[in-house]
C-alpha cells in the first residue's frame, strides 16, 4: 500500500532571465527512493539516481543544474518554459509517486511564489 | 557482442511514410544503459541525427527539430527491436539510415555511438 | 546547434608517418557538472557504417589500436595516428553528443601519399 505523499513548491511565477528552484518532498513513508526523474510534458530534463547520482539531458545541459537535494535548479529562464513540471519519485517497495509544479515566467518584474501544496 | 540489423524498404514513394526495424542482439531495447537511435547519411546533408528512444524507469523520446513534425521511434519489448516512422519522404529524406546504440558510459543520458546497423539506402522516387 | 567543422577536408600521408585531423566546435562541450567533454571520432570506410574509436575526446574504444589518440579542450580537438597503416585510408568525423541535435564534422578523407 502506498501510504506517502509529495510536498511540492506548487504554482511558481519567476521572471524571464531568472532562476528558480523545483523542490518535491516524498513523506509519510519509509520507502527507499531509487530515482528521481523531473519531467516537463513528457521530455526528461534529469535524473538522479540513487547509485549513479545526476545525470542531466542534453537538451538542458546549460540551463539545468542539480539540486539542492533532489529538487532542480532551472537558469535563464525564458518565457517558453512556462508549464507543468513533474517530479516522480521511483520508489521501492511503493513504486511511483508523482508531483507536479506549474512554473509561470513572466515578463515584469514581479514574481510571487504561491503556496505548497500536496499530492497523495 | 551487439548486433543491430535493420530491415525495410529500400524505395519510397513522395509523400509517403518510411518504415524501418532495427532488432537488437547481445543487449536490450529496455537496457537503462543504453539508447537506441536512428542516423542518416547522405552527400548534401553528411550525417544527420534523427532522433533516440530510451527507457529509465519509463520510455522517453528525443528527435531533431529538423524532422520532430513527421518522426515516430517506437521501441518493441516482445521483439526486442525498435523502429522509426518517417512521415511525408521528400526526395531530400534519400539517404543511408542507421540505428545505433548510444552507450550511456559515465552519464546515462548521452555517450557515443559505439555499435551500428549495417545501413539502408532509401531512395524517394516516383 | 552546435556546429562541427573539421580540417583539412581531405590528407594524404606517407605509410608509417603521422595523421592529425582537427575538429572545432563552435561551442564548448565540456560539462563543467562531471568535466567531461562530449566528442567522439568514428571512422569510415566505404560500404560501411561509420566505427566508434575514441570517446569522451581521448577514450579509445575496445579494440581500437592505440596507434590512435584523441586530444583536445574546450573547442578544439585533434584526432591524431602515429603511424598511418594502409587500412586506415577512411573518412574521419567527429561528432558531439553534448546538445541536440547530436552533430557530426564534415568528415576529413585520408589517403596514403
Known amino acids: 500500500m502506498m501510504t506517502g505523499t509529495i510536498e511540492t513548491t506548487g504554482n511558481i511565477s519567476a521572471e524571464k532571465g531568472g532562476s528558480i528552484i523545483l523542490q518535491c518532498h516524498l513523506s509519510s513513508t519509509t520507502a527507499q527512493v531509487t530515482q528521481v526523474n523531473w519531467e516537463q510534458q513528457d521530455q526528461l530534463l534529469a535524473i538522479c539516481n540513487a547509485d549513479l547520482g545526476w545525470h542531466i539531458s542534453p537538451s538542458f545541459k546549460d540551463r539545468v543544474a542539480p539540486g539542492p537535494g533532489l529538487g532542480l535548479t532551472l537558469q535563464s529562464l525564458t518565457v517558453n518554459d512556462t508549464g507543468e513540471y513533474f517530479c516522480i519519485y521511483h520508489t521501492y517497495p511503493d513504486g511511483t509517486y508523482t508531483g507536479r509544479i506549474f512554473l509561470e515566467v513572466l515578463e515584469s518584474s514581479v514574481a510571487e511564489h504561491g503556496a505548497r501544496f500536496q499530492i497523495p | 557482442q551487439v548486433q543491430l540489423q535493420q530491415s525495410g524498404p529500400g524505395l519510397v514513394k513522395p509523400s509517403q511514410t518510411l518504415s524501418l526495424t532495427c532488432a537488437i542482439s547481445g543487449d536490450s531495447v529496455s537496457s537503462n544503459s543504453a539508447v537506441w537511435n536512428w542516423i542518416r547519411q547522405s552527400p548534401s546533408r553528411g550525417l544527420e541525427w534523427l532522433g533516440r528512444?530510451?527507457?529509465?524507469?519509463?520510455?522517453?523520446?528525443d528527435y531533431a527539430v529538423s524532422v520532430k513534425s513527421r518522426i515516430t521511434i517506437n521501441p518493441d519489448t516482445s521483439k526486442n527491436q525498435f523502429s522509426l516512422q518517417l512521415n511525408s519522404m521528400t526526395p531530400e529524406d534519400t539517404a543511408v539510415y542507421y540505428c545505433?546504440?548510444?552507450?550511456?558510459?559515465?552519464?546515462?543520458?548521452?555517450?557515443?555511438?559505439?555499435?551500428w546497423g549495417q545501413g539502408t539506402l532509401v531512395t524517394v522516387s516516383s | 546547434d552546435i556546429v562541427m567543422t573539421q580540417s583539412p577536408d581531405s590528407l594524404a600521408v606517407s605509410l608509417g608517418e603521422r595523421a592529425t585531423i582537427n575538429c572545432k566546435s563552435s561551442q564548448s562541450v565540456l560539462f563543467g557538472f562531471n568535466n567531461k567533454i562530449y566528442l567522439a571520432w568514428y571512422q569510415q570506410k566505404p560500404g560501411q557504417p561509420p566505427e566508434l574509436l575514441i570517446y569522451w575526446a581521448s577514450t579509445r574504444e575496445s579494440g581500437v589500436p592505440d596507434r590512435f589518440s584523441g586530444s583536445g579542450s574546450g573547442t578544439d580537438f585533434t584526432l591524431t595516428i602515429s603511424s598511418l597503416q594502409a587500412e586506415d585510408v577512411a573518412v574521419y568525423y567527429c561528432q558531439q553528443y553534448y546538445s541536440f541535435p547530436y552533430t557530426f564534422g564534415q568528415g576529413t578523407k585520408l589517403e596514403i601519399k
Open positions: 545505433a546504440r548510444e552507450r550511456a558510459l559515465y552519464d546515462i543520458l548521452a555517450g557515443s555511438f559505439d555499435y
Open positions: 528512444t530510451y527507457y529509465r524507469s519509463k520510455w522517453y523520446n
